[in-house]
């Protein structure tokens, strides 16, 4: 707390200019009025403020709205968002993309901070759902924002704003964002022919159930060895040989190389071995002639 | 008076791992952001990572984003780099210093970290 | 990423010269930047930030000037411990980034 001082004669503010770098802390606390503060916010950050001076520039903001600030105040931070805690953001109530944006560019290329996640969360609990334009915004700062919401974030995605989603933003997601992700982009790209459903779905077959690979199979879609190894291990089981050769096309070849990696491994430990002989590639571990196969969950099921 | 007193530089293999300390004196530790500057031999100055006075906003360089992690021990009046995956091209002295957002006003005197097989 | 550019990347000069050493940053900004002299096997030493503001300490013949994209320092009457290398640095957005350095050498 900066102690209330008066302010000498003839350093009274005002206008916020390059002259109050020289002040002192006291000297801001005493001599710049925070309402002349709030209307000329947008020309703080063209004076280069030390972090000290700008701690007194906030806590006269915080003097003149205790309440959190107005978004015209908001919009024109700049570095001093960099000073706002969690606490002052969830006093917060912004609603504008823009004042979003120009947040989320002052901290540009710093780690995505408590004060962001606030920040994210606030605006996007404002608005009710994750639009496509605010998850546009989002992804585009922080590639893997996604995939840092839990799946019961992730459900309020409208299957519109699936758009907007690039390969690179799921690098990151497990399993379970991509069970909630997944039906959402089949909705979203349903209405696409083969070849671009494929291009599109892709990224998120990582939450693909059997019934949708087997349908992909039958697609002539070639899919690569990398897509391959993010399917769900329960989803790939049910495959048979020729299911996966068809899904695959050219890239089946990589299964030799992927054989000890799950899904693969598991894969082939529930294929005939006659069958995986089929592909000529020498894989090994199927299940030997002669042997039955007994599916017991099915087993447990009827019981 | 101020005083910055970087330690824990030496010769390490790429790909190998090292931890920078800078002990700091003489002024309110809590009170202030903190810096990390590097130096190649017989090169310029280049700004590596920064951390807010509490720690909770941090900023990587894109040249070791991912690799370094910047931290701090307010308790200890400590600064701290994390420096993994070491590469050939971060040979160099490394320097702490205090950053008051336009300017650097005290720097340590700098520890050396060499990077070769 | 904001590029700073330092001319002359060397200069000669002689103890009273006046010396001046300019800055270009490849986009505007106003009147953050900072000056550092640094001597060999020393550490950085800041002489003047806010463009035109002398640090505590730092003798009176060093100036700075300049806004927007174009920045000077100025040494009036220069002094034989002034021999050392001369870097800018913009702190106008991060990353923040250094001036390639100017050596200012004994004629």
């Known amino acids: 707390e900066v102690e209330k001082t008066a302010c000498p004669s003839g350093k009274k503010a005002r206008e916020i200019d390059e002259s109050l770098i020289f002040y002192k802390k006291w000297e801001l606390e005493a001599c710049v009025d925070a309402a002349l503060l709030a209307t000329q916010m947008d020309r703080v950050n063209a004076i280069p403020f030390t972090y000290e001076q700008l701690d007194v520039l906030k806590h006269k903001l915080d003097e003149l709205y205790p309440q959190g600030y107005p978004e015209s105040v908001i919009q024109h931070l700049g570095y001093l968002f960099l000073k706002m805690s969690p606490e002052d953001i969830r006093k917060w109530n912004v609603t504008s993309l823009e004042t979003l944006k120009a947040l989320l560019e002052v901290n540009k290329g710093h780690e995505m901070s408590p004060q962001v996640a606030t920040l994210i969360d606030r605006f996007v609990k404002g608005r009710g759902q994750l639009d496509k334009d605010t998850l546009d915004t989002l992804t585009a700062f922080y590639p893997g924002y996604l995939c840092s919401l839990s799946p019961e974030e992730l459900s309020s995605v409208p299957p519109s704003s699936i758009w907007a989603v690039r390969p690179q933003d799921l690098d990151t997601c497990d399993p379970r964002q991509l069970d909630v992700l997944y039906p959402k982009a089949r909705l979203a790209f349903q209405n696409m022919n083969g070849s671009e459903y494929f291009v599109k779905i892709q990224s998120f077959l990582g939450g693909a159930p059997t019934e949708d690979l087997k349908a992909l199979s039958q697609q002539n879609v070639s899919m690569d060895l990398a897509t391959f190894m993010k399917l769900r291990t329960d989803a790939v089981l049910p495959l048979t040989v020729a299911e996966v050769q068809k899904l695959l096309g050219p890239h089946v070849e990589g299964l030799k190389a992927e054989e000890r990696h799950r899904p693969v491994r598991d894969w082939i430990l529930r294929q005939r071995q006659d069958d995986l002989d089929t592909l000529g590639l020498g894989l090994q571990g199927g299940i030997p002639n002669g042997y039955l196969v007994l599916d017991l969950s099915m087993q447990e099921a009827l019981s | 008076q101020v005083q910055l007193v970087e330690s824990g530089g030496g010769l390490v293999k790429p790909g190998g791992s090292l931890r920078l300390s800078c002990a700091a004196s003489?002024?309110?530790?809590?009170?202030?952001?903190m810096t990390w500057i590097r130096q190649a031999p017989g090169k310029g100055l280049e700004w590596i990572s920064y951390?807010?006075?509490?720690?909770?906003?941090?900023y990587y360089a894109d040249s070791v984003k991912g690799r370094f992690t910047i931290s701090r021990d307010n308790a200890k009046n400590s600064l701290y780099l994390q420096m993994n995956s070491l590469r050939a091209e971060d040979t160099a002295v490394y320097y702490c210093?205090?950053?008051?957002?336009?300017?650097?006003?005290?720097w340590g005197q700098g520890t050396l970290v060499t990077v070769s097989s | 990423d904001i590029q700073m550019t330092q001319s002359p990347s060397s200069v000669s000069a002689s103890v009273g010269d006046r010396v001046t050493i300019t800055c270009r940053a490849s986009?505007?900004?106003?009147?953050?930047l900072a000056w550092y002299q640094q001597k060999p096997g020393k550490a950085p030493k800041l002489l003047i930030y806010?463009?035109?503001v002398l640090q505590s300490g730092v003798p009176s013949r060093f100036s700075g000037s300049g806004s927007g994209t174009d920045f000077t320092l100025t040494i009036s009457s220069l002094q034989p411990e002034d021999f050392a290398t001369y870097y800018c640095?913009?702190?106008?957005?991060?990353?923040?980034?250094f001036g390639q350095g100017t050596k200012v050498e004994i004629k």
């Open positions: 210093a205090r950053d008051r957002n336009s300017h650097f006003d005290y």
């Open positions: 003489g002024f309110t530790f809590s009170d202030y952001y």
């Open positions: 951390i807010s006075s509490s720690g909770s906003t941090i």
């Open positions: 986009q505007g900004i106003t009147r953050w």
């Open positions: 806010a463009a035109s």
């Open positions: 640095q913009q702190s106008n957005s991060f990353p923040r980034t």
